[in-house]
Interface confidence: low
């Protein structure tokens, strides 16, 4: 049952497993929420009646029943994690916290003209967790305008107190701010030979990627494979850290693989879901339960079911015993992880699914699409949006794409001339236009926030959001795609995509189908030298054949170029300009979505 | 229903001048970005010029800089192309469209049909 009120004045008593530090009762249940094992909490208030050492305490607990004894105590909150709910997740803390100082290791101070300043420090410096600001009001003259970078083991405060004139906050690396490097390779045959913070057992190299990526104290990672010579040490994820934040040395060691943290990039690539099974493998841990299952697929279910349940294995029937069904062994330890893996006993493992939420919904693998034709077929761009305007007659604007349960992201210069969202409908779910009918549901436009340095589309900030009156739920046919990250800025995209309902050719009409094209992106220099008219900037991206023939024309404004990269589709482009329709030589331009990260989360996220 | 009506084309000798209109009607023009597009005998349509609704902010072909001014009034809904030292690549019929962006605004019955203009001695 998922319980996401906090409880005023109420001690959960029993079942703790840890204790930390926390600024306010809402983040440390988002510290329960992460924690593998915690289901429920109490966090203590500063109050008059509490003794101040115990002040911001957030005491993490577990409970096999999923719920402990209530007493009443005055200054406790207590609540429940929210791994039993099944709404999205997040771990982006933007709060400031005014006269807190949050301790930890100071082990980068400078001066900063803002506390923003200094968050933003903290938010591009690798090690950074937290911070504290001393403001200009400070008493101390020497440490006004000083900003402390701090990081712990756990990656919360060791201690809280009360200090004037301080202000502390959060790294907002988790808020997919940050501009540190996004590095998603995996080196083959090599060791990083740095110090291990901690080591876990993990079934592959990308499972032991993700562990580091939500482990606080995570940089990067060497993984031990199954073939690893010293058996002891197969399936062995080693996590670890460096002053510099990057490997010092290097070691070429056949049957190991390596890695980095991908916490720049975790807004675009799952980090927390391990989604695959592993064949003839046994994941060892403690047992929740031992149910009959029909596949390692229902296996999963049950897991995913079962909020206590971490990871399983499932052991297939023998022939004709028990109606088909195999045993499912729900188990659980207290990192999430398996306390040791076997190979060759023929089980069938995998984790639960339960952690999905944690990761952006855009990360979800959609079906595969058809290659080949210009037509699409449903469900095979499932962000894509037909923005019509109903003013004087309805008809089809523009495109955009779903970006949050309630957030289109689109051209700004589809807004020419339109007056008042009022007159806005969005359609999602869409692929013929002709499905349109008087009956048929839509998406209100609360608010349309148009970037305020647009002008004109070819010089650039070319870039809207649409609030929804009403949010959407999520469906195979409408869900969102992901913002690419900041610290992918350098990688090259082959598979790149551009879709719409418009024109065919510049004098035509708007397609019933949505229609798509595989088009190469162009470098900037490139599309330079084809708009010498024009200055092609950073925060434009251009795509098109030499030749022409394929290209986004009237009507696809405002509509996405999706690029597929590791499996997850990215919104690299929005449809804005270009010289004609298909042109040699005459690239589409369309808006660099990667250089307006900022504002776009700035708008969809403010309070 | 949007309308658009080219005038002022024709025949004119190289380094002379011409003045080109637009009449729109149909739609709130003064919030519409428009521009001069051509179309030359056997090539593409070519972007020449066009002006921003909000600041009347003007960008031109690398071709035609410097000799062809765009204007507009939008009391009188009307877009201008005032075109000088003309040369005889500057041939080509003339259409008043929306920017260059790719939103629909005008259906494919809202472009106007054109007006010719011939640069020869």
């Known amino acids: 049952e998922c319980v996401t009120q906090l409880l005023k004045d109420t001690c959960f008593e029993g079942g703790d497993i840890t204790t930390v530090f926390t600024p306010s009762a809402k983040y440390c249940q988002v510290v329960c929420t992460y924690h593998p094992r915690c289901l429920l909490f109490t966090f203590t208030a500063e109050s008059p009646s509490e003794d101040p050492t115990r002040w911001f305490t957030c005491v993490l607990k577990d409970s096999v029943t999923e719920t402990l004894p209530r007493v009443n105590r005055t200054a406790a909150i207590s609540g429940y994690s929210f791994k039993q709910c099944s709404h999205q997740i997040s771990a982006c803390n933007k709060d400031i916290y005014v006269d807190l100082d949050m301790k930890g290791i100071n082990y980068n101070s400078s001066v900063a003209k803002s506390a923003q300043e200094c968050q933003e420090r903290c938010t591009d410096d690798v090690h950074c967790h937290f911070f504290t600001y001393a403001t200009r009001q400070f008493p101390s003259l020497e440490h006004r305008n000083i900003c402390l970078l701090k990081h712990t083991q756990t990656g919360t405060p060791t201690r809280i107190t009360k200090l004037d004139k301080v202000v502390s906050g959060f790294s907002l690396k988790s808020c997919a701010l940050s501009n540190l490097a996004c590095i998603r390779d995996i080196f083959p045959n090599t060791v990083f030979a740095d110090s291990n913070i901690d080591s876990v057992m993990a079934p592959d190299a990308f499972v032991c990627g993700r562990i580091c990526t939500h482990h606080p104290g995570c940089l990067f990672f060497t993984f031990f494979s199954q073939e690893w010579p010293k058996e002891s040490q197969r399936n062995l994820c080693l996590l670890k850290t460096s002053e510099s934040g990057l490997p010092s040395t290097r070691i070429k060691k056949s049957k190991a693989l390596s890695g980095f943290s991908l916490q720049s990039c975790r807004h675009s690539i799952p980090v927390f879901c391990h989604s695959s099974f592993y064949h003839d493998t046994d994941f060892l841990g403690e047992e929740l339960d031992i149910v009959a299952a029909k596949s390692h697929e229902a296996c999963q279910k049950l897991c995913t079911n079962a909020v206590r349940c971490q990871f399983f294995t499932y052991t297939p029937a023998q022939a004709s015993c028990n109606e088909g069904k195999g045993k499912c062994y729900l188990k659980l330890s207290s990192n999430g992880s398996p306390t040791k893996i076997l190979h060759g006993r023929g089980g069938i493992s995998g984790y639960t699914l339960r952690l999905c939420k944690m990761d952006n919904e855009c990360t979800t693998k959609i079906k595969p699409r058809i290659v080949g034709g210009t037509a699409s077929v449903r469900g095979e761009w499932p962000w894509q949006v037909t923005l019509h305007t109903t003013s004087p007659t309805q008809r089809h604007l523009c495109g955009g794409s779903i970006i949050g349960n309630q957030w289109i992201l689109t051209a700004a210069h589809c807004f020419y001339g339109v007056e008042s969202p009022k007159i806005l409908r969005v359609y999602s779910g869409i692929l013929n236009q002709s499905e349109i009918k008087e009956d048929t549901s839509f998406f209100g436009v609360q608010e349309i926030i148009i970037h305020d340095q647009y002008k004109m589309a070819e010089s650039g900030y070319d870039i809207a959001l649409l609030k929804l009156e009403t949010t959407v739920n999520y469906t195979d046919s409408q869900r969102p795609i992901c913002l690419p990250s900041k610290g992918d800025r350098n990688v090259i995209y082959t598979d790149c995509w551009v879709t719409g309902w418009g024109y065919r050719k510049l004098r035509d009409k708007i397609q019933n189908t949505l229609q798509k094209a595989k088009i190469p992106l162009v470098t900037n220099e490139e599309c330079q030298k084809r708009y010498r008219g024009h200055k092609i900037t950073h925060k434009m991206i251009c795509a098109g054949y030499r030749e022409g023939g394929k290209d986004a024309c009237k009507g696809d404004s405002g509509g996405p170029l999706s690029c597929k990269h590791n499996e997850v589709w990215h919104l690299v482009g929005i449809t804005s300009w270009g010289e004609g329709c298909a042109q040699r030589e005459r690239p589409g331009v369309y808006t660099n979505v990667v250089e307006y990260v900022d504002w776009i989360l700035e708008k969809t996220q403010a309070v | 229903q949007v309308q658009l009506q080219e005038s002022g084309g024709g025949l004119v000798q190289p380094g002379g001048s011409l003045r080109l209109s637009c009449a729109a009607s149909?739609?709130?023009?003064?919030?519409?970005?428009m521009s001069w597009v051509r179309q030359a005998p056997g090539k593409g349509l070519e972007g020449v010029s066009g002006i921003n609704s909000g600041d009347g902010s003007t960008y031109y072909a690398d071709s035609v800089k410097g000799r062809f001014t765009i204007s507009r009034d939008n009391a009188k809904n009307t877009l201008y192309l005032q075109m000088n030292s003309l040369k005889t690549e500057d041939t080509a019929v003339y259409y008043c469209a929306t920017g260059r962006t790719r939103e629909t605004y005008f259906r494919e019955d809202d472009w106007g049909q054109g007006t010719q203009v011939t640069v020869s001695s």
């Open positions: 149909g739609l709130t023009f003064s919030l519409y970005d």
